[in-house]
Structure formats: C-alpha cells, structure tokens
C-alpha cells in the first residue's frame, strides 16, 4: 500500500511540477520593470522567454515576439533550451510513469518491468526538475548581473545635458513559478525512485529451499509447484520487506476610446 501511495503521490507531484514548468516557460513575466527607487513611469515593461510586453496605465497592453533567433543573447537561448528539455523529459516521464503505476493493470506486465519504468520516469523527473531549476537560475543570475550593471550606469555621470534613465529589471513571477515547479518535479522524481525500490522483486528472499522428506531426499525449488501457497510464480507478485508488509493496490488588448480604467 505504501509503495502505491508513494508512487501515486510522486506521479501527482511531478504532474503538478511539469504543468508549472510549462506555465513558467510560457509566461511573459520572467523579468519585470523594477519600480523600487526608480523614476516611476506610466508604462510598465515585462519580458518573457518568447516576447516582451508593455502595459500602459491606460490599460493598453502590447506584446512583441522575439522574431529573431540569431540576434538573441546566448544565455536566453540556453534558458529556452533548458526549459524545453525539461518539458520534453517531464512529458516522456509522465507517459512512462502512467504505465508504471501499480494501480494500473496493463496485460500481464510484471512488477520488475513496472519497477524499471518507475525508476526511469523518476530519473526523468529529476533531470526535468534540475533543467527547470537550472534554466530559471541562469536567467535570474543574468538579471542580477544586468541589474547591478544598470544601477552603476544610473549613478555614474552621463555627461551632456540630457539624462537617460535606464530601465532596470527584476525577478518576475515566472521565476518563482519555475523554481517551485522544478522543485516539485524533482521531489516527484525522488518519490518515484523510492517507490521503485518497493516494486523491485527481491531475489534473495526465496532462493532454493530444501525440504527433506523422510524417505528420500528431494529438493523443491521455487516455481516447482504452480499451486503452492508460498512459492511458484506468485513470488513475483507478493513481496515481504523488512519495513512491513506491502500489498497491491502560457497581446494585445486594446482599450476602447469609450472604455476607461
């Protein structure tokens, strides 16, 4: 029961995590205009992995896609790649884990196969979560670096009469969604790996056991009698562990001239 619960919970947690990774990847708020200790503007800028947006105080929002591939910073491309790899691995992991779930019967799939699939999906979830966390962290690091660079520029002499205020960007909601989602996927993956240990048949449990009959010496090995209660092919489906018994079970909106905020 505990194996099923661990596996099921791992699946659900990973599913939520991957949904979060997808959401974070599609979100526009990876970086948002820093409003603290900055000249306050009537325009709010925010950027995602795929497009940048501007929201006016009028309520008008305009988003523009990054229609270039070569002109984008290498770091942004790297973050995109990490997030996509995370999503792909997570999606495959989910697919594999569905078939690995103990509560789902697929033909005569043996527990050893389910254990392997559970482990595979667990590893995929772990890598997926790590990819998301890495992607978000790389982007966050990029923001921190740019933030302090633009802060330095703001306070050094510009020269000339005209001041230009550089827009500084800080962490957007997508970063926090990404971190949490990556963490959940990672936790789900670990849970799947733990569940895998409970599914794997313990070969040392029932090695050849000799029964000495009074008249002649005959060795009965597991699998010898299909109808036997403790042995036979059933051993693969029923396992007893030291820990206790376990049984099966992501534009534009336009304000109308007649519609005001």
């Amino acid at each position: 029961m505990a194996v099923t619960a661990c596996q099921g919970l791992g699946f659900v947690v990973s599913l939520i995590g991957i949904a979060g990774i997808i959401a974070a990847t599609c979100m526009d708020q990876w970086s948002t205009q820093d409003l603290y200790n900055n000249p306050v503007t009537a325009v709010f800028n925010y950027q995602g992995l795929w497009r940048s947006c501007v929201r006016e105080s009028s309520g008008f929002t305009e988003c523009r896609g990054y229609f270039t591939l070569l002109g984008l910073p290498a770091m942004l491309q790297a973050v995109r790649a990490l997030m996509i790899v995370g999503i792909v691995l997570g999606a495959i992991g989910l697919l594999v884990s569905i078939f690995a779930l103990k509560c789902i019967r697929i033909g005569s799939m043996e527990d050893s196969a389910k254990a392997n699939m559970t482990l595979t999906s667990g590893i995929m979830f772990i890598v997926s979560g790590l990819c998301a966390i890495a992607g978000v962290s790389v982007f966050a690091n990029m923001l921190v670096t740019n933030f302090w660079m633009s802060t330095a520029n703001m306070y050094t002499g510009m020269g000339g009469m005209v001041q230009t205020v550089q827009t500084r960007y800080t962490f957007g909601a997508a970063l926090f969604v990404g971190w949490v989602a990556g963490g959940l996927t990672l936790i789900g993956g670990v849970m799947m790996c733990i569940a895998c240990r409970g599914l794997a048949p313990e070969e040392t449990n029932y090695k050849a056991v000799s029964y000495h009959a009074s008249g002649h010496s005959v060795a009965y090995k597991p699998g010898g009698f299909k109808a036997s209660t403790g042995f036979g092919s059933n051993t693969k489906n029923k396992k007893i562990y030291d820990g206790g018994a376990r049984t099966e079970d992501e534009v534009q909106s336009y304000p109308s001239k007649h519609d005001y905020v």
């Epitope: 503007t41 009537a42 325009v43 501007v54 006016e56 009028s58 523009r64 304000p255 005001y260």
Partner: antibody, heavy 117, light 113 residues
C-alpha cells in the same frame, strides 16, 4: 456620446477647500481619470489620477498634501478635493479620460475655481 | 520632474504655409520595450479644453486632419502643420506621458500672419 461633465464654477476664500466633480457618461467607468489645471494665461499642470475601479490614486508631489481624489461608482463620478486654497490655486480644473499612449482623449468642460478674499 | 520645453512661445504663419512647433524633454521619452515615444500633442482653443491631436509622438488621433503630423524620438519632437488653415489658430501643448508626474510644455500660440 462620450462625455465628462464637470460641476459648476466655485468662488472660495483662502484656506478653504473645494470639491470638483466629474461625471462620466457614454462609456464604461473603469479607466484612470486624470485631473489637470490651468491658471489664467498659463500652461497645463497635471495634478493626479484615480482609478475608478479600485480607487487607487497617484498624485503630483506638488499637490500631495492638499489633494484628495475619490470616486462614486454608483453614479460614475470622480471627485477632486483641494484643501488649504491660496490665490495661486485660481485656475480652470479639468478632468480627463486616459487613452492610448497614456494620452487624454476626452476632457471635461472645465471648472473655474476662483480663490479670493 | 521632467521638464518639457516648447519653442517658439508664439508663432505667426501665413495661411497655407507650413507651421513647425518644437518640444524638447529633459529625459528620453522612448520606451525600449515597445520602441514608442510617450509624447502627446494637444490643440487648445480659447475657452475650450485641450483636444488630442497626436499620441506616441507620431500617431494621429482619429478625426484629426492629415495636415497635422508628429515626428521625433527620445528628447526632441516636432509638430508640423503642413498647410495652415484658419481653424488651426490655437495654443499647442506637448505632454510627457512617460514619467510621473506627467508634465506639459509651456504651450505655443499659433497665429495667422
């Protein structure tokens, strides 16, 4: 027809307060409404803005201590109250509705406030 | 605060001639996010509220005659009336719609020569 209709002219004594109203008709009362004043023969001066949806407001620092902007959603009316009036507050006060580019597409007809002892 | 400096203070132009009004801001009004300049032009006739002519420095408001055009970027902007008509006699104001507090230029009085 889109209209912002303001209250009538007021004559106030120095130190008093004035409350000017701006009633919106012809459109949904949801967007920021701004207040701008114009002293006789002078340029335009932005005083602040109010969001009728949530009553959030932003004020020009120059008027922050003296101005209060409120709204009554039931009557689609916004109010601008200016306290501690001085003679230099004599001006025409306009309310304006915001549009693309944070520009002011619709204006009230203006309310003349005269501060005189 | 952002200072908006309009020039000239007053301008006399013959009917049918070109009128040019300049506006300079103390900080750039260009928003890098959408590459739009948050500068607006208004026309104000005596005893009337201002009328929106141009927003985003060059986008003409619907119903505004095409003889009115706006140009410029960053800190320097221009309002041009290609062929002055009698009804264009008014005061023209430029406005910073980017930084709070939103500020206006001193106005340019346009008259017929």
């Amino acid at each position: 027809q889109v209209q912002l209709v303001q209250s009538g002219a007021e004559v106030k004594k120095p130190g008093a307060s004035v409350k000017v109203s701006c009633k919106a008709s012809g459109y949904t009362f949801t967007n920021w409404v701004h207040w701008v004043r114009q002293a006789p023969g002078q340029g335009l001066e932005w005083m602040g803005e109010i969001n009728p949806t949530n009553a959030r407001s932003n004020y020009n620092e120059k008027f922050k201590k003296r101005v209060t902007m409120t709204r009554d959603r039931s009557t689609s009316t916004v109010y601008m109250e200016l306290s501690s009036l001085r003679s230099e507050d004599t001006a025409v006060y306009f309310c304006a509705g915001i549009y693309y580019g944070n520009s002011f597409a619709h204006w009230g007809q203006g309310t003349l406030v005269t501060v005189s002892s | 605060d952002i200072v908006m400096t309009q020039s000239p203070d007053s301008l006399a132009v013959s009917l049918g001639e070109r009128a040019t009004i300049n506006c300079k801001s103390s900080q750039s009004l260009l928003n890098a996010g959408n590459q739009k300049n948050y500068l607006t032009w208004y026309q104000q006739k005596p005893g009337q509220p201002p009328k929106l002519l141009i927003y985003w420095s060059s986008t003409r408001e619907s119903g505004v005659p095409d003889r009115f055009s706006g140009s410029g970027s960053g800190t320097d902007f221009t309002l041009t009336i290609s062929s002055l008509q009698a009804e264009d006699v008014a005061v023209y104001h430029c406005q910073n719609n980017y930084y709070y507090p939103l500020t206006f230029g001193g106005g340019t009085k346009l008259e017929i020569k």
